[in-house]
């Protein structure tokens, strides 16, 4: 995920402003980027320390740069350096003087092992001197002052990873400020081979792309992109994606591009020499022109892209019929992304042509670790990569880079990653109340450890001696009740927070036990509640056989209908009755009764009952005589109640008779609201009185009631209880 | 290949079969036309590798095919629709850019 | 995608005359290569496409020379000198620059 370039602006030095600018592009480096010299490479080079500075036209950028005036001070070997994950990338470059006595013909040269290898050296300055060669600031070969060729070389006929390093010629008379430097980069394995056994087969990397030996990816040359750089980028325009652009007014010319090895160093496609500051030849394209254009049926030759190819056609000769490719664009991948701490699956989305696949698709951590997708599928449209991190923690928030590397090109898009620490509450909740079947809790929410908002709450409770799953109920106040618990049981109790998003629900909370209290006795059987006096109910039941041997009682609660009037009684629990005195008159009372041990009994069903009166009572209300035949009527009413009526009683006669020739109905049963009597004469007017009784007496009707019985032969009439003042 | 009449929700396979040239030299595109409507090109299919291209109202019910060794191409059209009605014809280039240089006479797919 | 447009539903034209049908492009038919990737194409009554020109202004192979194709970016003239009887059908243009390949509505020359 480090796409580390080192632009060497001028390395052949004379009296101009030369530079070195290190650029960590499209990549968030924790750990500065380092400029300094390369002692490794040349011992003996100028010992003061460089100015380095950030270079203002881009966020993750060094620079040095030295005036003219410092010129003498700048041969010599440097290095550019950014560490990810611990690991430094080095990329390695050397500065000379343009007036050096040798000149080599390209800054790098990159072989294989065992190739046949000429490293070269142009003369200059023609001197009556010794040529001498050196390996890394060591002496390595000579050649008499009659014998220097032209093109001075260094023969390797099967050279080797350790013939690497920087070779450097001069007269023998001269000395550092006059050598002229060329760094040999012997890749680990034989042409087109990678892996620490040198036993994979390299990706074809195009347009002068170098296999890297242990990764078997192309490094691309600044221009170019893609698994097989065989995309060209857009003009001046360089890095892994081709998002750097060169801000000169010819592009790129004049700046000498070094990669990780083993690339090396050459010139932007487009340009050679080794200041590139050459233009191609016709026909010549690429980094240091070394490209031949061959394009199938005259297609243009682009010094910068190679052949421009029809539409349909592609391939580097646009050989090859087919769509046109399209590099890679990452979709639906938002800026920032807040994620709770544990499982994660994260989605990177792309398209292009061809569709990237599985092993195109990674995902880099803010650390450098590079993910590779769990999970791959792909549409007409897209390809979606799944991954999956087993377990995120807040150190991982940062920026998170999605990337996607096809033939067709790569791209990268960075994104912000917070993830956030679930909350759990610091304390245990409390309980405020108990039954034997229920607790009021106060789950204690606040404070929490961790991030909030909060989206909801969970109380979580289950039995402590019970192999059952924890049972639980959302919450959203700090007072819950808790139903349905069993009696006499000892509960464990915690509360667990959740957090908005995926995967919000934090580690529950501290733990609280309780127990609840012992169920209660069944009510006592057979309650019956009666009127004893006017301040005196009489309550009864059965005999209580408890199935324990606790100690019990009988508590009864009775309480006034009419006033704010409650007494609870105890009673012992081998008696079955209390007369509940005191009372007031005409007044209704409610009773109910529970049978206590230790832990309170279940209360019975409420029982009403009136006190006796202290008044006679009043007349009923209502009278009706309905349903008149020629020898029967209904006579009905209603009773106010609260009076202690015990029975009514309905007096009739013929009209016009003796009153002691009355005859009496006795109704016993209060609650008896009508009655029909029978036997009557037809067409016959009777009196009707009706009355009711209490412990006082009887009321005192104001009314007599007439009723005319029917013919016998006629239907029944109702005369709507027509009343007659006596 | 002849005319079809098909009912919808059947399958149609018409057939493009190429003589006088070496089949897997070019590629070969289908071209729809509606009774009395314009040209709309559906995509092609690359005779050399079999990989194929649809424009995007061809995507999902159409399919191109081959068979190389009888120098034939295939258009399936699968659920068939009424509005699938249409005549269909093949085309390749004469070289490198005469593309659509020669054309078959077209097939009648009538769905009803 | 790139939409072609073809104004004239019809032309009216006496055999003899000159004629010059008009065709345009919602974007640049020019790649970077210096070609523009407009083809002309007609259509005979119950016959086959025919490729007149490719790539703006080249005529293509066997096509009376009375043909001729001209335009800039995004603005295209197919002229016919001298019609002729066997003239008449539907011309269509096309671009090749971009999928998918796109026609334009088509325009019918009719003689007078």
């Known amino acids: 995920a480090m796409d580390l370039i080192l632009i060497n602006s001028l390395p052949l030095v004379s009296d101009a402003e030369t530079s070195l600018t290190c650029i960590a592009s499209g990549w968030r480096p924790h750990e500065p980027i380092t400029i300094g010299r390369d002692f490794e490479a040349l011992m003996n080079q100028h010992q003061d320390p460089l100015e380095v500075t950030q270079d203002v036209t881009r966020e993750w950028a060094k620079k040095v740069v030295w005036k003219r005036e410092k010129a003498s001070k700048i041969n010599g070997a440097y290095f550019c350096e950014g560490r990810v994950r611990g690991e430094a990338i080095r990329i390695r470059t050397m500065k000379m003087r343009q007036q050096a006595s040798f000149l080599p013909a390209t800054l790098t040269m990159t072989v294989d092992k065992g190739d046949n290898v000429n490293i070269s050296f142009k003369k200059v300055l023609i001197k009556e001197e010794d040529a001498v060669i050196y390996k890394n600031g060591s002496f390595i070969h000579s050649v008499p002052r009659h014998e220097v060729p032209d093109i001075l070389e260094v023969h390797l006929p099967h050279a080797q990873p350790q013939d690497a390093g920087v070779y450097s010629a001069r007269y023998i008379g001269g000395n550092l400020f006059t050598s002229a430097f060329t760094r040999l980069i012997v890749r680990r394995c034989e042409a087109q081979k990678w892996g620490p056994e040198c036993n994979h087969l390299c990706t074809a990397c195009m347009n002068n792309g170098v296999c890297h030996e242990d990764t078997g990816e192309c490094i691309c040359p600044p221009g170019f992109m893609g698994r097989t750089c065989e995309k060209a980028c857009e003009l001046h325009t360089f890095g892994r994606t081709c998002k750097e652009r060169c801000s000169g007014q010819e592009g790129c010319k004049s700046y000498v591009f070094c990669l990780p090895d083993p690339y090396g160093c050459s010139c932007a496609t487009g340009w050679k020499g080794l200041q590139c500051n050459e233009a191609c030849h016709p026909g010549f394209y690429g980094p240091d022109c070394k490209l031949r254009c061959s394009c199938n049926n005259g297609e243009m030759c682009d010094r910068f892209q190679g052949c421009l190819c029809s539409p349909g056609w592609q391939g580097l000769q646009c050989e090859r019929e087919g769509i046109q490719r399209m590099t890679p664009k990452i979709v639906d991948l938002p800026d920032h992304i807040e994620v709770n701490s544990g499982k994660f699956n994260p989605i990177c989305k792309a398209s292009g042509w061809p569709l990237p696949t599985n092993e195109e698709m990674t995902l880099v951590k803010p650390d450098g670790t590079v993910l590779h997708p769990k999970d791959f599928n792909h549409t007409d449209h897209f390809s979606v990569a799944i991954f999956t991190i087993h377990r995120i923690l807040p150190p991982d928030s940062g920026v998170w880079v999605c990337s996607v590397n096809t033939v067709a090109g790569m791209v990268e898009k960075p994104f912000n990653i917070s993830v956030k620490v679930l909350p759990k509450p610091l304390n245990a909740p409390n309980v405020i109340d108990t039954g034997h079947n229920f607790a009021v809790i106060n789950i204690s929410s606040e404070p929490y450890f961790g991030d909030g908002p909060i989206k909801s709450k969970k109380l979580l409770y289950k039995p402590v001696n019970h192999y059952e799953a924890w049972q639980h109920i959302q919450v959203t106040n700090e007072i819950v009740t808790l139903n349905y618990l069993e009696p006499r049981t000892e509960y464990e109790l915690c509360v667990q927070l959740v957090r908005r998003g995926e995967g919000g629900e934090g580690h529950p909370g501290p733990v609280r036990r309780f127990t609840t209290a012992s169920i209660g006795l069944p009510p006592p059987r057979g309650l019956n509640l009666l009127p004893k006096s006017q301040t005196t109910l009489n309550l009864t039941w059965q005999p209580i056989f408890p199935s324990s041997e606790d100690d019990f009682y009988v508590e009864v609660e009775r309480r006034s209908v009419q006033k704010s009037d409650q007494q609870n009684i105890k009673v012992p629990g081998n008696l079955t009755s209390v007369l509940l005195n005191n009372l007031h008159p005409r007044e209704q009372y409610v009773v109910r009764a529970r049978v206590n041990t230790k832990a309170q009994g279940e209360w019975s069903e409420d029982l009403t009952a009136w006190t006796l009166s202290d008044i006679l009572p009043p007349q009923p209300e209502n009278i009706k005589i309905s349903n008149i035949t020629h020898s029967s009527a209904v006579i009905s009413w209603t009773i106010l109640d609260g009076y202690s009526i015990s029975s009514i009683t309905i007096r009739y006669k013929v009209q016009g008779k003796n009153e002691d020739q009355h005859v009496d109905v006795k109704i016993k049963n209060a609650t008896i609201t009508q009655y029909q009597l029978k036997g009557l004469e037809p067409e016959t007017a009777y009196q009707v009185d009706i009355f009711a009784e209490n412990n006082i007496g009887s009321s005192n009707p104001a009314f007599s009631h007439e009723l005319v019985t029917l013919p016998e032969s006629q239907a029944p009439a109702d005369l709507g209880g027509g009343k007659m003042l006596l | 290949s002849g005319p079809e009449l098909k009912k919808p929700g059947e399958t149609v396979k018409i057939s493009c079969k190429a003589s006088?040239?070496?089949?897997?030299?070019?590629?070969i595109h289908w071209v729809k036309q509606a009774p009395g409507k314009g040209l709309k090109w559906m995509g092609w299919i690359n005779t050399e590798t079999g990989e194929t291209t649809y424009a995007e109202d061809f995507k999902g019910r159409f399919a191109f095919s081959l068979e190389t060794s009888a120098s034939t191409a295939y258009l399936q059209i699968n659920n068939l629709k009424n509005e699938d009605t249409a005549t269909y014809f093949c085309?390749?280039?004469?070289?490198?850019?005469?593309?659509?240089?020669?054309w078959g006479q077209g097939t009648l797919v009538t769905v009803s | 995608d790139i939409v072609m447009t073809q104004a004239a539903l019809s032309v009216p034209v006496t055999p003899g005359e000159s004629v010059s049908i008009s065709c345009r492009s919602s974007s640049s038919l020019l790649h970077r290569n210096g070609n523009t990737y407009l083809y002309w194409f007609l259509q005979r009554p119950g016959q086959s496409p025919q490729l007149l020109i490719y790539r703006m202004s080249n005529l293509a192979s066997g096509v009376p020379d009375r043909f001729s194709g001209s335009g800039s970016g995004t603005a295209f003239t197919l002229r016919i000198s001298r019609v002729e009887a066997e003239d008449v059908g539907v011309y269509y243009c096309m671009q090749r620059l971009e999928y998918p390949f796109t026609f334009g509505g088509g325009t019918k020359l009719e003689i007078k």
């Open positions: 085309s390749r280039r004469y070289d490198y850019d005469t593309w659509f240089a020669y």
């Open positions: 006088g040239y070496t089949f897997t030299d070019f590629s």
